[in-house]
């Protein structure tokens, strides 16, 4: 591994950059560490405020974590010649609050993108599609990691955060080849209708540690390749028949439902019956009731219809706001 800031082998590159020569294809940017053998560049925890312009053409894996990038403009990674090998880009924890349309254009091999732990007050609808055409060129992205990108309340613009993220996921139908999508820890209360229908290749979907209160309008029907669906640590109270049937109809799926505040009243009967016979839910023996009080901590699999009656009103603590 060579480092521009410490290795003598990089001195000529620094000199050539200073004399305004075009960047050499295999130089290492200042404040970064580079390994041509591993095709990897790491510019980590260096308080960078913009993406280095002189990235080596060989870069396949680029780590720009722990910086202070603030804004990713259109063409943030566009170079002449292009970074044609760049396949994995990690921008997590870099204090990004704005990702503009076309930020990832001209990266023809980009398969994995991690924007986690950035407080994104603005995510352009065209961040991943690159254009505002109703059908864009397919994105090469296969894995998109967007955990904990929710901004603090005072930085949210006057818009639904769920809607902003969804718009970027469906724009131009560019992400039809996406296999993995992580959206954990984003305070989502809901998924806008039809978002998943436009991501038909998904194999892994992580919605854990959100505040989802219902899946009634979420259609899983098109996700025939889905293998893992993570819904742990949400605010789900019951899954209704339509959802149960859709999940059961997915040939390969494993669903994770731990740590939701299940309401064990008469409306839970269908879900309990389904749980007892399905192989879809992982760790189903761990699912317990949260409400009503008299049912707290009862195991769902151990309930029968006589246990599931309807009291008129549930306590205010059931609410999610």
């Amino acid at each position: 591994t060579s480092s521009a800031s410490s290795s003598s082998s990089s001195a000529p590159f620094l000199a050539s950059a200073a004399s305004a020569q075009p960047p050499l294809p295999d130089q290492c940017p200042a404040l970064c560490e580079c390994s041509e053998a591993a095709r990897t560049v790491k510019c980590v925890n260096r308080n960078l405020t913009e993406v280095p312009t002189d990235l080596p053409l060989y870069v396949r894996n680029l780590f720009l974590t722990g910086n202070q990038l603030a804004v990713l403009p259109a063409g943030a990674f566009a170079r002449r010649p292009p970074l044609a090998e760049l396949a994995a880009l990690n921008l997590s924890g870099s204090r990004l609050d704005e990702v503009r349309g076309g930020a990832f254009e001209h990266l023809p091999s980009l398969r994995q993108l991690d924007l986690s732990h950035n407080p994104l007050a603005y995510l352009s609808p065209f961040a991943f599609s690159g254009s505002n055409a109703s059908i864009s060129a397919p994105s090469p992205l296969v894995e998109l990691i967007l955990n904990h990108i929710v901004p603090p309340d005072d930085k949210r613009q006057n818009r639904s955060f769920e809607g902003m993220v969804a718009a970027a996921l469906v724009a131009g139908r560019a992400l039809q080849g996406l296999h993995l999508l992580e959206l954990a820890s984003n305070h989502f209360l809901y998924l806008p209708r039809d978002v998943l229908a436009q991501l038909p290749s998904l194999r892994y979907l992580d919605l854990s540690n959100n505040s989802l209160v219902s899946l009634t309008y979420v259609s899983f029907r098109n996700l025939t390749h889905l293998e893992s669906l993570h819904l742990e640590d949400n605010a789900l109270k019951v899954l209704h028949n339509g959802t149960l049937a859709e999940l059961q109809g997915l040939p390969h799926v494993r669903v994770f439902l731990d740590n939701n505040p299940w309401v064990c009243d008469c409306h839970m009967a269908d879900m309990v019956t389904w749980l007892k016979q399905t192989g879809v839910v992982q760790g189903k023996d761990r699912l317990t009731c949260a409400f009503p009080e008299k049912m707290r901590n009862r195991v769902l699999l151990e309930l029968n219809s006589a246990d599931l009656d309807c009291d008129p009103i549930l306590p205010p603590s059931l609410q999610t706001s």
Epitope: P125, S134, S160, E162, G163, A166, A167, V170, A171, L189, Y190, L191, P192, R193, D194, V213, S214, T216, Y217, K237, V238, H240, H267, C310, Q319, T320, S321
Partner: antibody, heavy 118, light 107 residues
């Protein structure tokens, strides 16, 4: 910012038809269902139906099937509702409303008054 | 169709009062309830969705609670600008239906 601009008031004769428009701006039109709601004078709200602008799929309140037809023009980001065989019972203010959280309507047009009178 | 029965129809209030409106669904609508405010001559405005979640920009004096068939909407401290008609709506099953409305008027 999100805006829904509806067409102006209509005064029509019984038996006639009318087509109301709702032009959307400030968001991606195809990303959200559009709802239509009726409010008769001094009365509550009645949901007529919704349309998915992405594919034109519709879902009607049975009460308004045959009365209302919902369509969209994606190229102009405009939703339309046609009301046919009008009677005095159809006199009302009609709203288009964008869906936000599923089912709930987070932005509304200013309303279009339809008066059926001979 | 699910019927949403909203009470009371009218409420006479003074500034600073606490106001509670209830809505009862004819069958369970889970947590799929929204509340709207309509001021005179204006379009309705979404205040609360999924029972208890405030829409963007809605003051925290507006709250909602309930589950299943019984729902409550509360204004903790009424202000003059809150004079309006308030509607509940179930979005659990089509056709989506509204309550009859509650008119808030100043004493």
């Amino acid at each position: 910012q999100v805006q829904l601009q509806q067409s102006g008031p209509e005064v029509v004769k019984p038996g006639a038809s009318v087509k109301i428009s709702c032009k959307a701006s400030g968001y991606t039109f195809t990303d959200y269902y559009m709802n239509w709601v009726k409010q008769s004078r001094g009365k509550s709200l009645e949901w007529i139906g919704d349309i998915n602008p992405n594919n034109g799929g519709t879902n009607y309140n049975q009460k308004f099937k045959g009365k209302a037809t919902l369509t969209v023009d994606k190229s102009s980001s405009t939703a339309y509702m046609e009301l046919r065989s009008l009677t005095s019972e159809d006199s009302a203010v009609y709203y288009c409303a964008k869906e936000g959280p599923p089912g709930a309507m987070d932005y509304w047009g200013q309303g279009t008054s339809v008066t059926v009178s001979s | 169709n699910i019927v949403m029965t909203q009470t009371p129809k009218f409420l006479l209030v003074s500034a600073g009062d606490r106001v509670t409106i209830t809505c009862k669904a004819s069958q369970s609508v889970s947590n799929h309830v929204a509340w709207y405010q309509q001021k005179p001559g204006q379009s309705p405005k979404l205040l609360i969705y999924y029972v208890s979640n405030r829409s963007i920009g809605v003051p925290d004096r507006f709250t909602g609670s309930g589950y299943g068939t019984d729902f409550t909407f509360t204004i903790s401290t009424v202000q003059a600008e809150d004079l309006a008609v308030y509607f509940c709506q179930q979005v659990y099953s089509s056709p989506f239906t509204f309550g009859g409305g509650t008119r808030l008027e100043m004493k």
